[in-house]
């Protein structure tokens, strides 16, 4: 089937749109396939054999990551990037998506946030002076970018289903995640759903269905009673810290 | 392995309703979107909509509004096109897809 | 009046190489929305050929290939087979009509 392929495909950039967002209960029993409308890419770093994952903006990596070049002066060559750990509280950032979950940048620095202050991606308001010569900026991956938030923010912000490019697009809950036609806003994940767990171990292949990442608080781990299954097929789901 | 089976071939008169109905297996029906496109005789392929078929939400393509339903029946795996007033260039076959898969289609004929 | 413009018809001799291309616009391909091609042959559904701008799926050959650059795509077809014969519709989103397009198609007819 098509789906079957993409676990050898060596096309990590550019697959269709998302996963269909009719988002799963919690706890309910979903295939891992990846065709199944409650996947999304949560790419996490594994210590174990651990290798660059490459990606093409910040949704492409796990919630725990951003997209970026591995340094500033990497940029010009071939404009590589790959996906990176978050910045913790109080380190330096240009955007939201480089600050770890509970966090936004807020003058170039990685601020605590009560609740979700800005969804990822949105590039902070205070600091896009300093934009101009940002590798992501210019990455020429074919995704338009956003250099202003004022551009965006009397716009409606796409429901469940609604397409978008990157998760700054989708309201309060959703992230954007493919679904093969396009990518569309579903449901981030909550405790006890299924979620995509990648171990990076050569090739790569973006699932035509994503999953949205985990909610916040939660990780993706592998569940308890799996662990005695074989390791290609151990299920993870979105579990608290 | 993932099928979508579609009704048979209709004969509808200009003015009529018509209903036709796919039916999802091999797979999580639920987990999907599932999207109806219609191809007139020697013509191209033309987008209708799409239905959520867990929460049954829709999105239909401007030139149908008014004039299509997309309904969906969890409990049996299937979703649903009704389409309304119809008139002879709504002749057509009609495919359900799942983006990924496609049913073979049903062929409509509106002929008074 | 399809969003996405391809030419009518295309052709080549056996072994030879054919290109189709799809021209759209800054609300379609050039806003990144991905395009993806399916070949139709007469009287069957669409089968997917490219996904994603330039992936293959399983089964299809490498024969076929899909590339996009700005508010346009193509498809190459090197080594043409008399099997190849058929329709040929690229597809994608776009934003100003906020729903899926396909292209006007492209029938590849082998020579010989």
């Known amino acids: 089937t098509l789906n079957s392929v993409l676990i050898n495909s060596n096309a990590i950039k550019n697959l269709p749109p998302p996963l269909g967002g009719a988002g799963g209960q919690p706890g309910s029993a979903v295939s891992v396939a990846p065709g199944v409308l409650y996947e999304g890419g949560n790419k996490y770093q594994t210590l174990d054999n651990y290798q660059p994952y490459p990606c093409a903006e910040d949704e492409e990596c796990g919630s725990d990551e951003y997209c970026s070049s591995p340094s500033r002066g990497a940029a010009g060559v071939g404009g590589v990037q790959i996906c990176l750990a978050c910045r913790k509280r109080r380190k330096r950032c240009m955007r939201h998506a480089m600050c770890c979950p509970g966090n936004y940048c807020k003058n170039g620095i990685c601020m605590p946030s009560d609740h979700s202050h800005f969804p990822r991606g949105e590039i902070e308001e205070s600091i896009i002076e300093n934009l101009g010569n940002d590798h992501n900026a210019a990455a020429g991956d074919g995704y338009p970018r956003r250099t202003t938030l004022t551009s965006k923010i009397y716009h409606t912000k796409g429901q469940e289903g609604s397409v978008c490019l990157r998760s700054s697009d989708c309201a309060a809950g959703l992230c954007c995640a493919r679904h093969f036609w396009s990518k569309i806003c579903k449901p981030v994940l909550k405790e006890g759903q299924v979620c995509t767990k990648h171990k990076r171990k050569g090739s790569h292949g973006l699932e035509i269905f994503q999953r949205c990442y985990c909610g916040e608080g939660l990780a993706c781990r592998i569940q308890k009673d799996h662990h005695q299954a074989s390791n290609s097929s151990r299920l993870h789901t979105c579990q608290r810290h | 392995q993932v099928q979508l089976l579609q009704s048979a071939a209709e004969v509808k008169k200009p003015g009529e309703s018509l209903k036709i109905s796919c039916k999802g297996s091999?797979?999580?029906?639920?987990?999907?979107?599932l999207h109806w496109v219609r191809q007139a005789p020697g013509q191209g392929l033309e987008w209708m909509g799409w239905?959520?078929?867990?929460?049954?939400?829709?999105n239909y393509a401007q030139n149908f509004q008014g004039r299509v339903t997309m309904t969906r029946d969890t409990s049996i795996s299937a979703a649903y096109m009704e389409l309304s007033s119809l008139r002879s260039d709504d002749t057509a076959v009609y495919y359900c897809?799942?983006?990924?898969?496609w049913g073979r289609g049903t062929t409509v004929t509106v002929s008074s | 009046q399809s969003v996405l413009t391809q030419p009518p018809s295309a052709s080549g001799a056996p072994g030879q190489r054919v290109t189709i291309s799809c021209t759209g616009s800054?609300?379609?391909?050039?806003?990144?929305?991905?395009v993806h091609w399916y070949q139709q042959l007469p009287g069957a559904a669409p089968k997917l050929l490219i996904y994603g701008n330039s992936n293959r799926p399983s089964g299809v050959p490498d024969r076929f290939s899909g590339s996009k650059s700005g508010t346009s795509a193509s498809l190459a077809i090197t080594g043409l087979q008399a099997e190849d014969e058929a329709d040929y519709y690229c597809?994608?989103?776009?934003?100003?009509?906020?729903?899926?397009?396909f292209g006007t198609g492209t029938k590849v007819t082998v020579l010989g």
């Open positions: 897809t799942r983006e990924d898969h």
């Open positions: 239905i959520n078929a867990n929460s049954g939400a829709t």
């Open positions: 091999g797979y999580d029906f639920p987990g999907y979107y």
């Open positions: 800054s609300s379609n391909i050039g806003a990144g929305y991905d």
């Open positions: 597809q994608s989103y776009d934003s100003s009509l906020s729903g899926y397009v």
